[in-house]
Interface confidence: medium
């Protein structure tokens, strides 16, 4: 009952990052959804599509996937775009297993997030490197800016919009007023006025065994939204928790193995042992999910001598919610749960 089994580690070298400007747009805004959600086959999750628009039946192992048609996260699937170079537009749903990656001669472990350069944030998943651009939300030129244009500014990674008058002379600084919206065009002002935002952690991608949970945060020097990830394991897959429910009881909210253990990840072992708590199960179709938790840093040591650390969900307490409206998707209603204020650090 470790974080994950320890599979053999393979290296896979993806193609260098390509310009993705020619990718087709699978999302259309405003959203256009059918009047009623689809009925999914038993065991297939009903989820919100990747455009965050409509309900859809999640794509399954081997199905084609796009930014709109996403793979079933509750089955540990991800969209492998490696067969669609250089567009990375249409992928195939594949299983997340512990396979490492190599990019530009650097080895990354499965699940590891990294920045090969300042313009991309990448994650190694089962030998494939998936990258998201970090230069999406460029501060636009101020309103009525004369001759706006995009330029590369020394010391700044992403291109910036500048106004002709900003570029040709230093702008005088003046006391800042609160406008209907602040439209001053300096990059520094954007950073100084950055409103820190961190989203809640997403539900764990699997209902048992090793999964991934993500959140978006702009708490960084650039004030750019970046995705953070942490490992999570709500309950072991190889323990039938139902058998541990005491007679006359309907639920076992928390399951904690008696022995402490080391976590393993992609063949690497945690440097210290832990005695984690897991969420249990309920007999009456209710979902058992964490409501008190935090994120801990776990250090791993690999056989080849390399080490790394990973953020991991640490469960303190779970509860069985009132109902699971959709039996196909135990996470569908997480947003409507009462706010139990998960400890986010």
């Amino acid at each position: 009952t470790a974080l994950s089994p320890a599979p053999t580690t393979m290296d896979f070298t993806p193609a260098p990052l390509e310009d993705t400007s020619s990718r087709p747009q699978f999302c259309k805004w405003p959203c256009e959804c059918p009047p009623s959600p689809p009925r999914c086959p038993l065991g297939v999750s009903l989820i919100t599509d990747g455009c965050e628009c409509c309900k859809m039946c999640a794509q399954q192992l081997g199905d084609n996937c796009t930014e709109a048609a996403i793979c079933d996260p509750h089955r540990g699937l991800y969209c492998d775009y490696s067969g669609d170079r250089p567009r990375y537009a249409i992928g195939v749903c594949a299983q997340v297993v512990g396979v490492g990656c190599v990019l530009d001669g650097v080895r990354y472990n499965n699940g590891q997030s990294f920045q090969p350069n300042c313009k991309y944030n990448c994650t190694c998943i089962d030998g494939a490197v998936g990258c998201t651009p970090l230069c999406l939300r460029v501060r636009p030129p101020r309103l009525w800016c004369p001759h706006p244009r995009r330029v590369s500014i020394p010391g700044h990674c992403c291109e910036q919009w500048v106004c002709e008058d900003d570029a040709k002379r230093p702008r005088k600084t003046a006391p800042r007023d609160t406008g209907a919206f602040d439209a001053v065009g300096e990059v520094e002002a954007w950073h100084r006025n950055c409103i820190a935002y961190t989203s809640p952690w997403s539900p764990c991608s699997t209902s048992c065994g090793l999964g991934v949970s993500t959140r978006i945060s702009n708490v960084n020097a650039q004030c750019w939204p970046e995705q953070e990830s942490r490992l999570c394991n709500l309950r072991p897959c190889d323990v039938d928790i139902h058998t541990l429910i005491k007679a006359g009881k309907k639920c076992l909210a928390v399951y904690q193995p008696e022995a402490s253990m080391n976590f393993t990840l992609a063949g690497c072992i945690s440097t210290r042992s832990y005695q984690p708590k897991y969420c249990g199960v309920c007999m009456d179709n209710r979902c058992c999910i964490p409501y008190k938790s935090k994120t801990i840093d776990v250090s791993f040591q690999c056989p080849d001598g390399l080490g790394f650390s990973r953020q991991v969900l640490w469960i303190n307490a779970c509860f069985c919610n009132l109902s699971c409206r959709n039996p196909n998707d135990i996470f569908a209603d997480l947003e409507s749960y009462p706010d139990f204020s998960e400890i986010a650090n």
Partner: antibody
Framework: QVQLVQSGREMKKPGASMKVSCKAS????????ISWVRQAPGQGLEWMGW????????HYAQKLQGRVTMTTDTSTSTAYLELRRLRSDDTAVYFC??????WGQGTLVTVSS | QSVLTQPPSVSGAPGQRVTISCTGT?????????VYWYQQLPGKPPKVLID???DRPSGVPDRVSGSKSDTSASLAITGLQAEDEADYYC???????????FGGGTKLTVL
């Protein structure tokens, strides 16, 4: 609070010139540039140009080049719009607006013989 | 004729959702220039609803949202109310004209 107060309505003859003022208050005048936008009766909005209140640099709409002049007086925190060789289709409400998203109340200029 | 094309009018019943489109070209919206949305009530100056960051300035209700893709943009208003009846304009920069351009405007009628 931030305010842009414009001069009163004007009646002009074709071929004449007009000059509309826009007095700013409630913020540092040189912080924001000023744009001028006009709206003919029952019609849409038309951007006329922009002036930096900081250094007087201007940026005019191509169709008005040669007829329009925008100026500022930092001592009185006032921006001015001058339009020459007026025609009947210049009849409109003229608005000033700063880079911060604030607008004046508008000045109606009627051009008629 | 504006280089940013908007439908002359749209209408919806109270509580409904309406969208107003703004179609441009490769020299304005398609070039990545920001788009602003304005509401103008009769006899009043325009008021910004969506700024160039696709954000709502303070005081604009979250019933209002903007989106942009390629050479078009749209403004969506949900939970339509009587006070939403007004003219709506999109605004962007056009590199060909070397200036800021408004869409032709859309009159929203709440039935």
């Amino acid at each position: 609070q931030v305010q842009l107060v414009q001069s009163g309505r004007e009646m002009k003859k074709p071929g004449a010139s007009m000059k509309v003022s826009c007095k700013a208050s409630g913020y540092t005048f040189t912080k924001y540039g000023i744009s001028w936008v006009r709206q003919a009766p029952g019609q849409g909005l038309e951007w006329m140009g922009w002036i930096s209140a900081d250094n007087g640099k201007t940026h005019y709409a191509q169709k008005l080049q040669g007829r329009v002049t925008m100026t500022t007086d930092t001592s009185t925190s006032t921006a001015y719009l001058e339009l020459r060789r007026l025609r009947s289709d210049d009849t409109a409400v003229y608005f000033c607006a700063n880079d911060g998203g604030y607008w004046g109340q508008g000045t109606l200029v009627t051009v008629s013989s | 004729q504006s280089v940013l094309t908007q439908p002359p009018s749209v209408s919806g019943a109270p509580g409904q959702r309406v969208t107003i489109s703004c179609t441009g070209t490769s020299s304005n919206l398609g070039a990545g220039f920001p788009v602003y949305w304005y509401q103008q009530l009769p006899g009043k100056p325009p008021k910004v609803l969506i700024d160039g960051n696709n954000d709502r300035p303070s005081g604009v209700p979250d019933r209002v949202s903007g989106s942009k893709s390629d050479t078009s943009a749209s403004l969506a208003i949900t939970g339509l109310q009587a006070e939403d009846e007004a003219d709506y304009y999109c605004l962007s920069y056009d590199s060909g004209l070397d200036g800021w351009v408004f869409g032709g405007g859309t009159k929203l009628t709440v039935l």
